[in-house]
């Protein structure tokens, strides 16, 4: 019996270390700036990267530029997005800008697209200053199910600040779905 | 048989409640406004309370000024930092402020620092105004390893606001490494 | 023997998912801008949504624009505030302005409220801009005992962004306390 | 006070090089500041051509980019336009201007350039 | 590229006389216009910033307003000084383009 009771100990431990590591899926996605969109209008961003550096990614998919949902569950999301301009690169077409994130989710199944959580500022980047800079940060609480695409929307891409720490998204999943 | 069943289940609730108590470090560390450095460079911040108030940490340890993680496995990492001054304080060096926070980790067997996320803006603080305030959030999800270490760096060190609830940063454990 | 152990397996793995799901409370709250407080002054917002759309609840309570916490634990706090004006809603009392989210814990037990968690920016919002926005994001690791009560503060109520993935706060439980 | 000055051929033939150079005198046109050639067609519309910077980075109209290019002379305070394969359709006054708090606020008098065979 | 269309083509006044003339938008710009005037056989001159921001050594009797898409340049009670032609330019986005103008003329 005793003997049994360590098998069951055993497998329980196995079972559950198992298990909880499936039951958690997972990503963190930082920028691609090999491929960011020109202008001042709102884009998707669809290129991220997923296995370097900060990047990376368990349980979940990337792909065609959105984090695709494998497992049901509620996931705690957020987006970290940084805009950036040096007066070395460039004029900018208006110094009245609108610097924003959308974070959606997109359903395959009833093709809809809505946005989870937005945030960003107004900002005045006068030529009067040499460097300028702006993050926005975003978190929250949802529900994902299989097959559920998230993807980043941002205006003015082409101000977007390129390195790993500064611009990237991600999930983890917190807990099942009763 | 069903005594042992009893206390396999015992013995399993214990195990279970324990083994996810030990599973999940975290920490939440707030300001120690004694010891904040002046000047309008780039700092690390290393005085922080971790047992007062709202700071608290367990399953990891505060040293030198950095929190140091004791365990393996996937963290959120988050930090709030909150920028002040108010006329009475006496006047800006400039008007022309960058704002900014660095969340930095330090691995001690290769010795490296690597910033893990970065946040802030440019601001222009004029004198037009009596109060001046401005705050940084920034979170994300990474894999961390035991002796690896977390801090904190700021610019305008002696800009910030001291309160519990302005200026903290933390980590908790999410998952463990596969 | 093998049959108590399927027995203890099947039980065990009920419990551990039953235990698991209860022991996770969440929320995510949303704001009812259907009576949203006019003024510029800080007020307590009491109207959020709970059951519609992004917001949900589990195993805690929303009560008298509160967020009760039902279940002790250490909690994963978190607020998005977008505020906005458009030259078509009229002038603005002044084009300084203090935006800012105050995120409170107020213990019935012994009456008292204390500032978990705050943020935002002072705001020159002036009449050469059609349009303003600016977003605050907070979000900390608090411990919470049953009984406990969350709730949101702002200054300048009426120039929140009514939308559902604008204005929200919310709580997920990450751990027990020892 | 800023001032600027076009020249260059009056005349190009279709399927040449247009060259203006503009002469910028009362400021450096390497401290800060962009810019600019634009130009006006026979019956007085606007077209923003391309600029470039102080730091020496460019920006051209899409409409004209493969046949576009700015360039600067630093030591004589001038920068340069020059566009190629050209057509009766490029006929037009050429200005350059310079542009601040994102308005164009000197300009050149322009200098009238005919594609003609 | 952003499509600037202002009307009327031409304007025939007589000095004294308050005149409005309009510039339409492709696409919501904000407030991110300006107005140029260009007397003939010279080059334009910057007259109003960010669709009603004042320029330093223009006369007070010009103004902008307007958002979005739709803008308008006034001029309160106008001078002789004033014919010539009046183009809008956006810089919401590059390419910078301009409206092909309102011509001013004496009735």
């Known amino acids: 019996i005793r003997a049994e009771k360590a098998m069951v100990d055993g497998s329980w431990l196995d079972l559950a270390k198992r298990s909880k590591l499936e039951a958690q899926p997972f990503a963190h996605l930082t920028i691609n700036a090999t491929n960011i969109p020109t202008g001042s209008h709102k884009v998707s961003l669809s290129s991220w990267y997923h296995d370097r550096g900060w990047a990376k990614i368990s349980n979940m998919t990337f792909s065609n530029g959105k984090l695709i949902v494998n497992q049901d569950g509620f996931y705690y999301l957020y987006a970290n997005i940084c805009f950036r301009h040096h007066e070395t690169s460039g004029d900018l077409a208006t110094e009245y800008l609108q610097l924003m994130v959308y974070v959606t989710k997109t359903s395959i199944k009833i093709p809809s697209s809505h946005t989870l959580m937005k945030g960003g500022s107004t900002k005045y980047w006068s030529g009067n200053s040499e460097f300028h800079f702006y993050s926005i940060n975003v978190g929250g609480f949802f529900k994902l199910r299989s097959g559920e695409e998230i993807s980043v929307e941002v205006s003015n891409p082409s101000l977007l600040d390129p390195d790993q720490d500064a611009t990237y998204f991600g999930a983890f999943k917190v807990r099942d779905i009763d | 048989i069903r005594a042992e069943k009893a206390m396999v289940d015992g013995s399993w609730l214990d195990l279970a409640k324990r083994s996810k108590l030990e599973a999940q470090p975290f920490a939440h560390l707030t300001i120690n406004a004694t010891n904040i450095p002046t000047g309008s460079h780039k700092v690390s911040l290393s005085s922080w309370y971790h047992d007062r108030g709202w700071a608290k940490i367990s399953n990891m340890t505060f040293s030198n000024g950095k929190l140091i993680v004791n365990q393996d496995g996937f963290y959120y990492l988050y930090a709030n930092i909150c920028f002040r001054h108010h006329e009475t304080s006496g006047d800006l060096a400039t008007e022309y402020l960058q704002l900014m926070v660095y969340v930095t980790k330090t691995s001690i067997k290769i010795p490296s620092s690597h910033t893990l996320m970065k946040g802030g803006s440019t601001k222009y603080w004029s004198g037009n105004s009596e109060f001046h305030f401005y705050s940084i959030n920034v979170g994300g999800f990474f894999k961390l390893r035991s002796g690896e270490e977390i801090s904190v760096e700021v610019s305008n060190p002696s800009l910030l606001d001291p309160d519990q609830d302005a200026t903290y940063f933390g980590a908790f454990k999410v998952r463990d490494i596969d | 023997i093998r049959a108590e152990k399927a027995m203890v397996d099947g039980s065990w793995l009920d419990l551990a998912k039953r235990s698991k799901l209860e022991a996770q409370p969440f929320a995510h709250l949303t704001i009812n801008a259907t009576n949203i407080p006019t003024g510029s002054h800080k007020v307590s917002l009491s109207s959020w949504y709970h059951d519609r759309g992004w917001a949900k609840i589990s195993n805690m309570t929303f009560s008298n624009g509160k967020l009760i916490v039902n279940q002790d634990g250490f909690y994963y706090l978190y607020a998005n505030i977008c505020f906005r004006h458009h030259e078509t809603s009229g002038d603005l009392a002044t084009e300084y302005l203090q935006l800012m989210v105050y995120v409170t814990k107020t213990s019935i037990k012994i009456p008292s409220s204390h500032t978990l968690m705050k943020g935002g920016s002072t705001k020159y919002w002036s009449g050469n801009s059609e349009f303003h926005f600016y977003s605050i994001n907070v979000g900390g690791f608090f411990k919470l005992r049953s009984g406990e009560e969350i709730s949101v503060e702002v200054s300048n109520p009426s120039l929140l962004d009514p939308d559902q993935d604008a204005t929200y706060f919310g709580a997920f439980k990450v751990r027990d306390i020892d | 006070d800023v001032q600027l000055q076009e020249s260059g051929p009056d005349l190009v033939k279709p399927s040449q090089s247009l060259s203006l150079t503009c002469t910028v005198t009362?400021?450096?046109?390497?401290?800060?500041?962009?810019w600019h050639w634009i130009r006006q067609f026979p019956g007085n519309k606007l077209e923003w051509m391309g600029y470039i910077h102080f730091s020496g980075v460019t920006n051209y109209n899409p409409s004209l980019k493969s046949r576009i290019s700015i360039t600067r002379d630093a030591s004589k305070n001038q920068f340069f336009l020059q566009l190629s394969s050209v057509t009766t359709e490029d006929t037009a006054t050429y200005y350059c201007?310079?542009?601040?708090?994102?308005?164009?606020?000197?300009w050149g008098q322009g200098t009238l350039v005919t594609v003609s065979a | 590229d952003i499509v600037l269309t202002q009307s009327p083509a031409t304007l025939s006044v007589t000095p004294g006389d308050s005149v409005s003339l309009s510039c339409r938008a492709s696409?919501?710009?904000?407030?991110?216009l300006h107005w140029y005037q260009q007397k003939s056989h010279e080059s334009p001159r910057l007259l109003i910033k960010y669709a009603s921001q004042s320029i330093s050594g223009i006369p007070s009797r010009f103004s902008g307003s307007g958002s979005g898409t739709d803008f308008t340049l006034s001029i309160n009670s106008v001078e002789t000084e004033d014919f010539g032609i009046y183009f809008c330019q956006q810089i919401n986005s590059w390419p910078l383009t301009f409206g092909a103008g309102t011509k001013l003329e004496l009735k």
């Open positions: 201007a310079t542009r601040r708090e994102t308005g164009f606020t000197y």
């Open positions: 696409q919501s710009i904000s407030k991110n």
């Open positions: 009362g400021y450096s046109i390497t401290s800060a500041y962009s």
